[in-house]
């Protein structure tokens, strides 16, 4: 921002009223008046170029310093060319000297040269030659000097003429301030510019109404340079929650809009499924039946729990069931749907029911499922099972009602035994099997059926209560098809896969384990 100038003295604006001291009186500098555009123009002039040893002084009135530390002195003046005078006037000069003196009181007409300190010799950029002077085309020069730091109550300026032809039209003395400033939603007060060129005065800003320093952010600061310019902004303020930046101020969010945190972003329109917000809202309340999960941003629409899974099937395969379902028709407006499967088993005879999570096995953990199918195994035969699939999303925990669908299935068979070959010889095969422990109590006997591969006309059956059997009197180097089936009081259970096992050839010896 441009520096602000505070004027302490303005000769041109004073209209000849200042009454500066001249020394010697009347013989050197003197006040003159000219009329330009019907306005009086005043100037102090001296032109004693034909006389040697000039020492003419013009002293300003006493100027109260106030809060100024460094003053700037702007001079507007004309200087006539020494060649305008006969023989170039050997004593003629084309410069004058600028002085100042500080004091705590006004000395009035008591003028003492020795109190004055020279600031500089003032030389014109352009001199006014004779022809220009006579044609009224004077060359106006502008020079600026500065002095500081000043410490006394006031000061004088003085102009020493040593034989020039000078007209001083304007003397303006001012100091600079960094103007009051609004930047980054921070207010910086008007600040006096420092006196030393390299130094920058650090000025703390204050956040405007309804603005705050963001968490972890730097407090707003600016630097006021010697020329009254603000430099090097540090930190900023942001409009607080419920307010947005409008030009250099923070304005409350309009009804129907909200802003949930201090940020640079504007107020946002209330999302779907919210109630109209009042002015200055930091969030928008959800409509009845809609909710916001703790981790949901305020900008997200309010949502509700999903409806139940749309379609659920339970397909039994022996002692296994494959559950399949389709997503809810109403997702509640969310994408974070998960499913939970629970299981209940009932004994047909007694009608007694209970949870069966401990006795069954799921193909993947039954809670927090993202897929829409799961396989349940280790089911007991001749038992009724009811499976419940519940759909949940991020706001389901905020309501007491649940969204689920159930499917029931009756298990009539045991699970097929898992068969393995334990050993073989040229004439025998040793076979074992297993079924899930919960089902073992229901099994009365196991039936092992075997036959030569390729012979579909005859087969042999062996029954046993145990979990293994050795099949003897077999032909060497022959492949047999073997199947094991559990027998229960209610009938046959599911049969195992048909396995192909081969006896050893005569060259092979002994009973070798496989």
């Amino acid at each position: 921002a441009q520096g602000k100038e505070v004027v302490l003295l303005d000769f041109a604006a004073a209209g000849g009223e200042l009454g500066w001291l001249t020394h010697p009186y009347g013989k050197g500098w003197d006040l003159m008046q000219n009329i330009m555009n019907d306005m009086p123009i005043y100037m102090y002039s001296v032109c004693n170029v034909m006389s040697g040893d000039q020492d003419n002084w013009l002293r300003t009135n006493w100027v109260y310093r106030g809060e100024a530390e460094r003053i700037f002195i702007e001079l507007k003046f004309t200087v006539r060319d020494c060649n305008s005078f006969p023989g170039g006037a050997s004593s003629c000069k084309e410069t004058f000297n600028l002085y100042y003196a500080e004091s705590d009181l006004d000395y009035g007409t008591n003028f003492q040269k020795r109190l004055f300190t020279k600031i500089d010799t003032i030389a014109p950029d352009e001199i006014t030659v004779s022809s220009d002077f006579e044609a009224r085309h004077v060359k106006l020069n502008v020079e600026e000097r500065s002095v500081g730091p000043l410490t006394r109550k006031g000061f004088y300026l003085a102009f020493q003429d040593i034989g020039a032809c000078v007209a001083l039209l304007s003397v303006r003395v001012y100091y600079k301030k960094c103007p009051e400033l609004l930047q980054g939603l921070a207010h910086f007060p008007e600040t006096i510019a420092g006196s030393d060129a390299p130094s920058l005065a650090t000025v703390a800003g204050t956040c405007v109404d309804h603005a705050v320093v963001p968490p972890g952010g730097e407090e707003p600061r600016m630097h006021c340079a010697v020329d009254g310019e603000w430099l090097v902004p540090i930190g900023q303020c942001l409009c607080q929650a419920g307010y947005e930046k409008v030009e250099d101020a923070c304005q409350a969010c309009s009804p129907g809009f909200f802003k949930f945190e201090a940020s640079e972003s504007p107020c946002l329109e209330c999302p779907e499924h919210t109630l109209p917000s009042p002015e200055g809202a930091t969030s928008c309340e959800c409509e009845e039946g809609f909710f916001r999960a703790p981790q949901d941003p305020a900008s997200m629409p309010c949502t509700r729990p999903p409806s139940a899974p749309h379609y659920l099937t339970a397909v039994g395969m022996g002692a296994k069931v494959e559950l399949r379902w389709t997503p809810p028709q109403d997702s509640g407006g969310r994408e974070d749907i998960v499913y939970s499967v629970t299981c209940e088993q009932c004994w047909p005879e007694s009608g007694e029911c209970g949870p069966c999570e401990a006795s069954v096995r799921y193909s993947e953990p039954p809670h927090g499922l993202t897929r829409t199918s799961v396989t349940v195994s280790d089911l007991e035969p001749h038992m009724n099972y009811t499976f419940t699939v519940e759909a949940r999303n991020g706001v389901s925990g905020l309501v007491t009602s649940r969204s689920f669908r159930t499917a029931s299935v009756s298990i009539n068979q045991t699970e097929p035994p898992k068969v393995r070959l334990e050993g073989r010889s040229t004439t025998s095969l040793s076979v074992s099997w297993s079924i899930p422990p919960p089902q073992q109590s229901r099994v009365w006997k196991y039936e092992v059926t075997y036959r030569k591969k390729g012979d579909s006309n005859s087969y042999n059956v062996r029954r046993t209560e145990g979990f293994s059997v050795t099949l003897d009197d077999l032909a060497p180097d022959t492949t047999y098809l073997v199947q094991v089936q559990a027998l229960t009081q209610e009938g046959q259970g599911a049969g195992s896969k048909v396995h192909e096992f081969q006896t050893l050839s005569p060259e092979g010896s002994g009973n070798l384990a496989v």
Epitope: G16, E17, G19, T22, P24, Y25, G26, K27, D30, L31, M32, Q33, N34, I35, Y42, Y44, S45, C47, N48, V49, M50, S51, S84, F85, P86, G108, T109, R136, C165
Partner: antibody, heavy 120, light 108 residues
Framework: QVQLVQSGGGLVQPGGSLRLSCAAS????????MHWVRQAPGKGLEWVTV????????YYADSVKGRFTISRDNSKNTLYLQMNSLRAEDTAVYYC?????????????WGQGTLVTVSS | SELTQPPSVSVAPGQTVTITCQGD??????ASWYQQKPGTAPKLLIY???NRPSGVPDRFSGSSSGTSASLTITGAQAEDEADYYC????????????FGGGTKLTVL
């Protein structure tokens, strides 16, 4: 209105003294340098003396230096010229005049003039 | 330092007349011009570059060049018959201010 009214002239013998007065009205007397200008009978104007607005600075023409004293009383808005050791060549109409700006004029307001005759 | 004027100048009514003023001081400082009619105090006509106090007719004008200053009356009138004096600051330092000897203008 702005005016200067003079008094105190008359006939005086050579070597005698006379005091002229000039009463100002219609302007801020204390802000202006004041002059005395004289005009001998049938002759031109001759500058005599000046006094600065506060009265601290005074200058005289060589012809009157040491004999004439200019003074002012700003509280009474009056300018004075004390003339001592008067000579025949001091015979003239004496005018008080206001310097409109600065010390040296121009002279924008003049008194009506007062005749001083030095004769035995 | 002296300012030199012609002792007398005459002009026919309605004509233009110029009164001159010569002097070294005029290189440095502008002349002022005064009109004096018999039995009255002088009256300021022109000062500075060419400035007229209020009430002075615009037929009076001033100019300067080098060591010379001029007062011009364009369209002289009978009432302009008077003595005219130039005046300037003294650049020599000998005097504070100097007057010319005066010019008697006769309007024929």
């Amino acid at each position: 209105q702005v005016q200067l009214v003079q008094s105190g002239g008359g006939l005086v013998q050579p070597g005698g003294s006379l005091r002229l007065s000039c009463a100002a009205s219609g302007f801020t007397f204390s802000s202006y340098a004041m002059h005395w200008v004289r005009q001998a009978p049938g002759k031109g104007l001759e500058w005599v003396t000046v006094i600065s607005p506060p009265g601290s600075n005074k200058y005289y023409a060589d012809s009157v230096k040491g004999r004439f004293t200019i003074s002012r009383d700003n509280s009474k808005n009056t300018l004075y010229l004390q003339m001592n050791s008067l000579r025949a060549e001091d015979t003239a109409v004496y005018y008080c005049a206001r310097a409109s700006v600065g010390a040296t004029g121009p002279f924008d307001i003049w008194g009506q003039g007062t005749l001083v005759t030095v004769s035995s | 330092s002296e300012l030199t004027q012609p002792p007398s100048v005459s002009v026919a009514p309605g004509q233009t007349v110029t009164i001159t003023c010569q002097g070294d001081s005029l290189r440095s400082y502008y002349a002022s011009w005064y009109q004096q009619k018999p039995g009255t105090a002088p009256k300021l006509l022109i000062y500075g570059e060419n400035n007229r106090p209020s009430g002075v007719p615009d037929r009076f004008s001033g100019s300067s060049s080098g060591t010379s200053a001029s007062l011009t009356i364009t369209g002289a009138q009978a009432e302009d018959e008077a003595d005219y004096y130039c005046n300037s600051r003294d650049s020599s330092g000998t005097h504070l201010t100097v007057f010319g000897g005066g010019t008697k203008l006769t309007v024929l």
